[in-house]
């Protein structure tokens, strides 16, 4: 049975040209995290695997940095980076947990951080 919950940074906004940290945290489960995949819509951004370390997908290498922790740092943001991001936790024995983050990249300096929220 899947008992865990994923807490994410929720709905966030950032300035064009700036950087942002995408964070997810899996709690309330003793399941072993095998791998965390970060995806934007259907595109793979990065992988963090317990045995093999970090991998940043080639098309994002210049603007994505691993960490902190299992999180992901997006740099040199553009308006095109606006959209949904998913952290997909592959765990044993529970299975797959998915967290969603919505990022809005703003032209002006009015970027504010949204509230944190949980996805069961």
């Amino acid at each position: 049975m899947m008992t865990g919950t994923i807490e994410t940074t929720g709905n966030i906004s950032a300035e064009k040209g700036g950087s942002i940290i995408l964070q997810c945290h899996l709690s309330s489960t003793t399941a072993q995290v095998t791998q965390v995949n970060w995806e934007q819509q259907d595109q793979l951004l990065a992988i963090c695997n317990a045995d093999l370390g970090w991998h940043i997908s080639p098309s994002f290498k210049d603007r994505v940095a691993p960490g902190p922790g299992l999180g992901l740092t997006l740099q040199s943001l553009t308006v095109n980076d606006t959209g949904e991001y998913f952290c997909i936790y592959h765990t044993y024995p529970d299975g797959t947990y998915t967290g969603r983050i919505f990022l809005e990249v703003l032209e002006s300096s009015v970027a504010e951080h949204g509230a944190r929220f949980q996805i069961p």
């Epitope: 072993q32 095998t34 791998q35 995949n37 793979l44 992988i47 695997n49 045995d51 093999l52 370390g53 991998h55 997908s57 080639p58 592959h90 044993y92």
Partner: antibody, heavy 120, light 110 residues
């Protein structure tokens, strides 16, 4: 179409060397962990070696450790296996295989194999 | 000697259900995922089951995988003559840090 094509097999004397290549096509090679698996005549499958996305993490079966080296060139979409100090027991069909995006899940794409014969 | 243990052979008649077992230890099957492969004579292996119980697209639902403790099994229902092949289980071993295979099971359709 997702494809793996091995080459470089042949007849070699004991103590000799051989370099196998595996050309990948139809997928983003950089995003996948790769392995070499071999099969001696009339025998079962034996895993040989594994390499992560950018080649900074490699693993080997005890039977080939110190003699074989796995590597990859992502710019050429090619996987390699450098085999040194070859022995008669290395005679086998060598397959390159792609791991599932979560590498521990399984090997989802296999090449057709290349035959290595070690004999005097 | 393979790290994972499979029966050397199995057999069944067309339409029957056949199960092939795969036995491991606490550092592989018990805490990791199992995958199963079918190898027809003279061909490369083909993935049948990944993540212990999931089927890749194109694999008939006659094939199913399950796992309990340090053992896993592959079940083939509605056996067909074209299922005659060698079947292999495999898992990542956390202690050895290696990909381990079973010795293979030769399935004969009588």
């Amino acid at each position: 179409e997702v494809q793996l094509l091995e080459s470089g097999g042949g007849l070699v004397q004991p103590g000799g060397s051989l370099r196998l290549s595996c050309a990948a096509s139809g997928f983003t090679f950089d995003d996948y962990v790769m392995s070499w698996v071999r099969q001696a005549p009339g025998k079962g499958l034996e895993w040989v070696s594994l390499i992560n996305w950018n080649g900074d993490k490699t693993y080997y079966a005890d039977s080939v450790k110190g003699r074989f080296t796995i590597s990859r060139d992502n710019s050429k979409n090619t996987l390699y296996l450098q085999m040194n100090s070859l022995r008669a027991e290395d005679t086998a069909v060598y397959y390159c295989a792609r791991h599932w995006i979560v590498f521990q899940y399984g090997l989802d794409v296999w090449g057709q194999g290349t035959t290595v014969t070690v004999s005097s | 000697q393979s790290v994972l243990t499979q029966p050397l052979s199995a057999s069944g008649t067309p339409g029957q259900r056949v199960t092939i077992s795969c036995s491991g230890v606490s550092s592989n099957i018990e805490i990791k995922y199992v995958s199963w492969y079918q190898q027809l004579p003279g061909t490369a292996p083909k993935l049948l089951i990944y993540n212990s119980h999931q089927r890749p697209s194109g694999v008939p639902d006659r094939f199913s995988g399950s796992k309990s403790g340090t053992s896993a099994s592959l079940a083939i229902s509605g056996l067909q003559s074209e299922d005659e092949a060698d079947y292999y289980c495999t898992s990542w071993d956390d202690r050895l840090k290696s990909w381990v295979f079973g010795g293979g099971t030769k399935l004969t359709v009588l």
